[in-house]
Amino acid sequence: KNLKSPQKVEVDIIDDNFILRWNRSDESVGNVTFSFDYQKTGMDNWIKLSGCQNITSTKCNFSSLKLNVYEEIKLRIRAEKENTSSWYEVDSFTPFRKAQIGPPEVHLEAEDKAIVIHISPGTKDSVMWALDGLSFTYSLVIWKNSSGVEERIENIYSRHKIYKLSPETTYCLKVKAALLTSWKIGVYSPVHCIKTTVENELPPPENIEVSVQNQNYVLKWDYTYANMTFQVQWLHAFLKRNPGNHLYKWKQIPDCENVKTTQCVFPQNVFQKGIYLLRVQASDGNNTSFWSEEIKFDTEIQAFLLPPVFNIRSLSDSFHIYIGAPKQSGNTPVIQDYPLIYEIIFWENTSNAERKIIEKKTDVTVPNLKPLTVYCVKARAHTMDEKLNKSSVFSDAVCEKTKPGNTSK
C-alpha cells in the first residue's frame, strides 16, 4: 500500500524554540516514522533536519539547528515505513517573522501598599531577539485575588512598581512582552500571586523635592515622625529599561546616608549630566520603612530651573508683575528652552494669609488689592512636563506699597 504524505504541517516558534506539528494522513497504518528536510534560500540541495529524523510521534523540535533567523527557509516532510511517501512541501517562512515572544520571567517583591515587579525575557541570551533585547516593553493585568476585577497596565519596562494597594491582600498578575518595532505581542506569563505585607508602622517618606542652592543640590522630603534617620539612593533612569545590565543597582548618596533631618545637601558634581531616579527610606533604629515613591531628577532642568526674576508696577488696586529670565552668576540671563508655568504667592505684609496665582504668561495682574497697603510677592517656576515635574525654589520676596485710590489706569 502506498504511504500518503503527512498533511497540515504547523511551525510554532516561541523565542528560540522551533516546534513542528503535523497530521498523520493515514491513522490505520502503524509503525510509521516521519522525517524532515530543510532548504535555505538560494540553495538547491535539501539537508536533513536534525532532531526531526525518523520521528514516531507527530511533533518534533529543531531548536538545536543554528539558523539565520532573518533568512527564509523551506521544509518538506515524508512518511516512512518499508517504503516512503512522496515529499510534502511546507510554505517557506522567515523564522523571525513567524516567531512569537515567549512568556517573560516575573519576580515580585511585596510591600504593604505596593508591589515591585521585576520582568526579564523568558529566554536568556535569546538568538531570536538578540538585536531587539533592549526594545522589549511589557504590559500586565493585575487583579485582587478576592474580586477578580482586572486592571491593565501598558507600556511598562523591566522594573515597575504598583502603588496604592491594600495591606495584607493577595494580588495576582500576569505579564506579556511586546516588540513594538516588529509589531509582535508575546504570550502571557503564568499567573503570579503575592500577598502584600502587614502595614508598616513607619510610612515611607513623601513629597521629595530637589532644588539647587549655590553649587549644591538640596533634597527635601516630608516625614510623619521625629527622631528618625534617613537614607537616599539613586539610579540612572535609563537602567529601568534594562535591569539585566550589571550597572542596575541603587546606590547610596554618601552625604545622604543616615541623615537625621528631612533634608540633605550634596555637591552638584555627585551627578554627571543625565536623568536619575531618587528614593528615600526612613528608620527608627529598630524598624525600617519601605522605600518612598521614586522621583525623576534631571540635572539639566534642575541645574537651570532658577527662580524667576520679576518687576512690579504698583497701582492702587492691583500689581502688574513682569516676569523675566533668571540671571546666572555674571548677570547673564538663562535661556530656558522648555515651557514653564509660574506660581506667584502674595500676601499683605501685616498678615500671614497667602494667596496664590498660577500663570503661563510672563505678565500677570494681581487684582483686588487695597490702596496704600504693603504687599509682598514671591514666585517660582515649574516645568510643564508631568513626568519631570520640577520646580525652582521661590525667589526672594519683594514688597511694594499700592498707590492711593483712583490710580488704576
Epitope: 519576580h107 510591600e111 515591585v116 521585576h118 522594573r159 502587614v198 508598616n200 550589571h246 543597582k249
Partner: antibody, heavy 123, light 107 residues
C-alpha cells in the same frame, strides 16, 4: 545549573588568618549578592556578611566587621572570605550562599549554597 | 538585631504525620522569611522564601504561612527523607538572623 564550589578544609593556629574561596558557575556572577554563613559544630547558622561581585560593595555582621574581608575575582567568578585573628570559637563550617539579584529593591533568601569549608582553629 | 525564636527545638514524629514548626521574630519582618532544611553533613537547602513561596523542586507537602512577627512551616504528611533540622531566617534587616533550629526525628 547553578553551582558554588568551595575550597578544602583548613587547620589554623589561634591568631592566624584563613581565606576561603567560593567559585560560582551556571549564572551571571555579577548579578547576585554572595553571602557567607558559618555553622559551629552542632550549632545553628550565623550570617557573616555579603558582597556584590559587580563592584565589591560589602555589608557585614557587626560581630565580624573588624576581622572579616570579602573580595571577588570576576575573571574566575570567585569570591573570597578572609577571617583574621582566629580563635578556637571560630572553628566552624563556612558556607557561601547566593542571595538575591542586585537589581532587587530588597534582600532575598539564600537559594544556592556551597558544600561548606571546615575551618579548625587549634593550637 | 532581630531575634528569631523557633519552636519546638526538637520534635519526634512518624511517617505520615502532619508537623508544624513556628518561628517568631522580635520585630515585624514583612514576610521576608525563609525556611531551610539541613541534613547532617550537608549544606542547608532553601524550601520556602517570602514566608509562603515554595521553591521549585520542593514537594508540595511543605507549606509556609504567617505574617508580621509569626510564621509557620507545615509538612502535611511526613516522608522518611524529611527527617532533618529546619531553620527559619529573616532577611528584612541586616544582619540576617536565623532561628536556633528544629530537629525533626523519627518517633
Amino acid at each position: 545549573q547553578v553551582q558554588l564550589v568551595q575550597s578544602g578544609a583548613e587547620v589554623k593556629k589561634p591568631g592566624a588568618s584563613v581565606k576561603v574561596s567560593c567559585k560560582a558557575s551556571g549564572y551571571t556572577f555579577t548579578s547576585y549578592w554572595m553571602n557567607w554563613v558559618r555553622q559551629a559544630p552542632g550549632q545553628g547558622l550565623e550570617w557573616m556578611g555579603k558582597i556584590d561581585p559587580s563592584d565589591s560593595e560589602t555589608h557585614f555582621n557587626q560581630k565580624f566587621r573588624d576581622r572579616v574581608t570579602m573580595t571577588r575575582d570576576t575573571s574566575t567568578s570567585t569570591v573570597y572570605m578572609e577571617l583574621s585573628s582566629l580563635r578556637s570559637e571560630d572553628t566552624a563550617v563556612y558556607y557561601c550562599a547566593r542571595g538575591g539579584r542586585i537589581s532587587f529593591d530588597y534582600d532575598a533568601a539564600l537559594d544556592y549554597w556551597g558544600q561548606g569549608t571546615l575551618v579548625t582553629v587549634s593550637s | 538585631d532581630i531575634q528569631m525564636t523557633q519552636s519546638p527545638s526538637s520534635l519526634s514524629a512518624s511517617v505520615g504525620d502532619r508537623v508544624t514548626i513556628t518561628c517568631k521574630s522580635s520585630e515585624v519582618i514583612y514576610n521576608r522569611l525563609a525556611w531551610y532544611q539541613q541534613k547532617p553533613g550537608n549544606a542547608p537547602k532553601l524550601l520556602i522564601s517570602g514566608a509562603t513561596t515554595l521553591e521549585s523542586g520542593v514537594p508540595s507537602r511543605f507549606s509556609g504561612s504567617g505574617s508580621g512577627k509569626d510564621y509557620t512551616l507545615t509538612i502535611s504528611s511526613l516522608q522518611p527523607e524529611d527527617f532533618a533540622t529546619y531553620y527559619c531566617q529573616q532577611y528584612w534587616n541586616k544582619p540576617f538572623t536565623f532561628g536556633q533550629g528544629t530537629k525533626l526525628e523519627i518517633k
